[in-house]
């Protein structure tokens, strides 16, 4: 067993060694969204570029119909940034009358869908109040964390208002995941 | 071929096994920038601490002249946080007259330079409008994502205004990359 | 030495191959904090959920008494998001009288404690001024970076004001680390 001498035996019992370059990985970048109907109380999902420019999928990680498909069970690091932009937010007007109010907000959610489970699972949420006065505004929300996923799980990015997403540049709004 | 029994053959065909501790990695931390001339329409690059305190480079990942040098092709996770700070932003004055305007902004870009390619590639951008009234302000921009890089690529962090970066502490402003 | 043919010899000299699934990892999620005494000039540490819902610890990474315990020396990626929420910040009132002042702020610090070293080390800090007028506000601070840690090191997340942390959902406020 000479070839094992650098790989302690307690590790080999339950997990095969594997080449890093073979792991499922994806980095998706923003594209112009087509206006679509979505349910009133449900945040719409973004769709993504998966092969042009900086975008790629590899090693059986596939993108289809707004979803990243997880091809292999394991621990994944998942991340996304969404840059939002808009004009003076509504709350600034109401402020002037001196009445506090529910602020405008921007929200990003990374959601997991498991076919065998009826409800999607919210993995990550970034949410910000937006109360700007007298000028256009823009700002990103960044999210990233590690999750245990199962083969067949699907990941998507949902936003509170698809019309505020900055889809102009691939470096401003993106979504990715990789097996650790 | 006893030593291969825990490494499935389909992986070994195109990617060698390799020890994780041997992978190129760097975490760079902020240092005070010396005011220097730079081109008018180009965001200046930050320079970094690469060996004192929390900062390090290892396994052939080198830092030189504002650049991280990529020593080996592969998929890298790249990240940076820049903390900005300033005084009341200009737009707050214009607001008072009730006129919307182009807001002040802060921007961070992680840029890739490939010697064989004439134009730098913007990998990541975080950009925020800043419209503060009546007090000093401070806030971070965080970025992180995975990219396929080639041996010889160089990475840098550019900012919209080098004079607004918080240089005081190594935990506030930093830049790193590691091979996955 | 047939089993070594896919693992270049220069790597094997100083680092054993190891299975990725065996690496220490944790993702902790927010729980309601119990009001506790803390020193006046010291940011309080958050405590966390470590096994329910999305939370987990594995491969000898343990959570105890607000700390993640590092079971093995190496390079770790460490991350946290804390979502804060509050009412109109104090500075907005003072602004109305036309007097600039020190703004309210929200701060997250990821701290390393090494028993053999007297002072904790601040690894990461995210800090933002909060000057909102006329409405409730909410916003996240996200941090993440790579650090070289030693077996026995302990990690915690400190915040400037524990009463402003949004502890309502596991996807809004979280803390994690994994060995690279």
């Amino acid at each position: 067993l000479k070839g094992q001498e650098f790989a302690p035996s307690h590790q080999q019992v339950y997990a095969p060694l594997r080449a890093d370059g073979d792991k499922p990985r994806a980095h998706l970048t923003v594209v112009r969204q087509t206006p679509t109907q979505h349910f009133k109380n449900q945040f719409p999902a973004l769709h993504w570029e998966h092969e042009l420019g900086l975008a790629f999928t590899k090693n059986r990680m596939n993108y289809t119909n707004k979803f990243l498909l997880i091809p292999e069970s394991g621990d994944y690091f998942i991340y996304s940034q969404v840059t939002f932009r808009g004009m003076t937010s509504e709350c600034s007007e109401i402020r002037r009358a001196g009445r506090p109010n529910k602020p405008d907000s921007i929200t990003v959610v990374i959601t997991k869908v498991t076919d065998s489970y009826p409800e999607p699972t919210q993995l990550l949420m970034g949410t910000k109040s937006v109360c700007e006065v007298g000028s256009n505004w823009f700002q990103p929300i960044y999210l990233g964390a590690m999750f245990s996923l199962q083969e067949g799980d699907k990941l998507m990015v949902n936003v509170s208002d698809i019309s505020l997403v900055d889809y102009t540049k691939e470096d401003k709004t993106f979504f990715g995941a990789f097996l650790l | 071929l006893k030593g291969q029994e825990f490494a499935p053959s389909h992986q070994q065909v195109y990617a060698p096994l390799r020890a994780d501790g041997d992978k190129p990695r760097a975490h760079l931390t902020v240092v005070r920038q010396t005011p220097t001339q730079h081109f008018k329409n180009q965001f200046p690059a930050l320079h970094w601490e690469h060996e004192l305190g929390l900062a390090f480079t290892k396994n052939r990942m080198n830092y030189t002249n504002k650049f991280l040098l990529i020593p080996e092709s592969g998929d890298y996770f790249i990240y940076s946080q820049v903390t900005f700070r300033g005084m009341t932003s200009e737009c707050s004055e214009i607001r008072r007259a009730g006129r919307p305007n182009k807001p002040d902004s802060i921007t961070v870009v992680i840029t890739k330079v490939t010697d064989s390619y004439p134009e730098p590639t913007q990998l990541l951008m975080g950009t925020k409008s800043v419209c503060e009234v009546g007090s000093n302000w401070f806030q971070p921009i965080y970025l992180g994502a995975m990219f396929s890089l080639q041996e010889g690529d160089k990475l840098m962090v550019n900012v919209s205004d080098i004079s607004l970066v918080d240089y005081t502490k190594e935990d506030k402003t930093f830049f790193g990359a590691f091979l996955l | 030495l047939k089993g070594q043919e896919f693992a270049p010899s220069h790597q094997q000299v100083y680092a054993p191959l190891r299975a990725d699934g065996d690496k220490p990892r944790a993702h902790l999620t927010v729980v309601r904090q119990t009001p506790t005494q803390h020193f006046k000039n010291q940011f309080p540490a958050l405590h966390w959920e470590h096994e329910l819902g999305l939370a987990f610890t594995k491969n000898r990474m343990n959570y105890t008494n607000k700390f993640l315990l590092i079971p093995e020396s190496g390079d770790y990626f460490i991350y946290s998001q804390v979502t804060f929420r509050g009412m109109t910040s104090e500075c907005s009132e003072i602004r109305r009288a036309g007097r600039p002042n020190k703004p309210d702020s929200i701060t997250v610090v990821i701290t390393k404690v090494t028993d053999s070293y007297p002072e904790p080390t601040q690894l990461l800090m995210g800090t933002k001024s909060v000057c909102e007028v006329g409405s409730n506000w909410f916003q996240p601070i996200y941090l993440g970076a790579m650090f070289s840690l030693q077996e026995g090191d302990k990690l915690m997340v400190n915040v400037s004001d524990i009463s402003l942390v949004d502890y309502t959902k596991e996807d809004k406020t979280f803390f994690g680390a994994f060995l690279l």
Epitope: - | V31, R32, Q33, T34, P35, T36, Q37, H38, K40, P44, R85, G86, M87, E90, N136, D161, I162, S163, L164, V165, Y167, T168, K169 | K102
Partner: antibody, heavy 117, light 108 residues
């Protein structure tokens, strides 16, 4: 609100060492860089140099060979030493907070240092 | 080093009038890294403008900075009695940081 209080000897003979100290209150010392600036009738305002909470310094090249800016063992206050003074070093010396970067938004009261034989 | 020349040396104006102060650099100042200060006799300077045009916290909007490259201007739209003082420019586009010689604004 930030306050800077400075003290030190106001009258020196040529070749002596100027020594001034500045204490900061009202803000965290570690959140800023801290500078020394002087003002003389002959040369106007002149930046001497700055320091941060870790003791890292930047100096004006024209004074670098004679200047040391340092921290107290506790970090705050910080001090200025200027060796081998001449009449040309006669000036009002100010300590100041460097904020946001390389500009000075808060100043000490100033100390007139006169070099005369 | 960059040398800053301020003109005029003295400006004699009445309250309510507009003051225009000039600061010229011996070479281009990077990123418009230029600041303006106000100083009363026997007091420390006070920061008015940084980044050529950004007002410092608490500075009234009658003070306006403009310019880029080598030519910069501080404009006081309507002089108030408390505006009579000496004004200095400072560049921070390259090291060492340098100051201009000052413009005195006096009451006519």
């Amino acid at each position: 609100q930030v306050q800077l209080h400075q003290w030190g000897a106001g009258l020196l003979k040529p070749s002596e060492t100027l020594s001034l100290t500045c204490a900061v209150s009202g803000v965290s010392f570690s959140d800023y860089h801290w500078a020394w600036i002087r003002q003389s009738p002959g040369k106007g305002l002149e930046w001497i140099g700055d320091i941060n909470h870790r003791g890292r310094t930047n100096y004006n090249p024209s004074l670098k060979s004679r200047v040391t800016i340092s921290l107290d063992t506790s970090g705050n206050p910080f001090s200025l030493k200027l060796t081998s003074v001449t009449a040309a070093d006669t000036a009002v010396y100010y300590c100041a907070r460097d904020f946001p970067n390389w500009v000075f938004d808060s100043w000490g009261q100033g100390i007139l240092v006169t070099v005369s034989s | 080093e960059i040398v800053l020349s301020q003109s005029p040396g003295t400006l004699s104006l009445s309250p309510g009038e507009r003051a225009t102060l000039s600061c010229r650099a011996s070479q281009s100042v990077s990123s418009s890294f230029l600041a303006w200060y106000q100083q009363y006799p026997g007091q420390a300077p006070r920061l008015l403008i940084y980044g050529a045009s950004r007002r410092a916290t608490g500075i009234p909007d009658r003070f306006r900075g403009s310019g880029s490259g080598t030519d910069f201007t501080l404009t006081i739209s309507r002089l108030e009695p408390e505006d009579f003082a000496v004004y200095y420019c400072q560049q921070y586009g390259s090291s060492p940081l340098t100051f201009g010689g000052g413009t005195k604004v006096e009451n006519k």
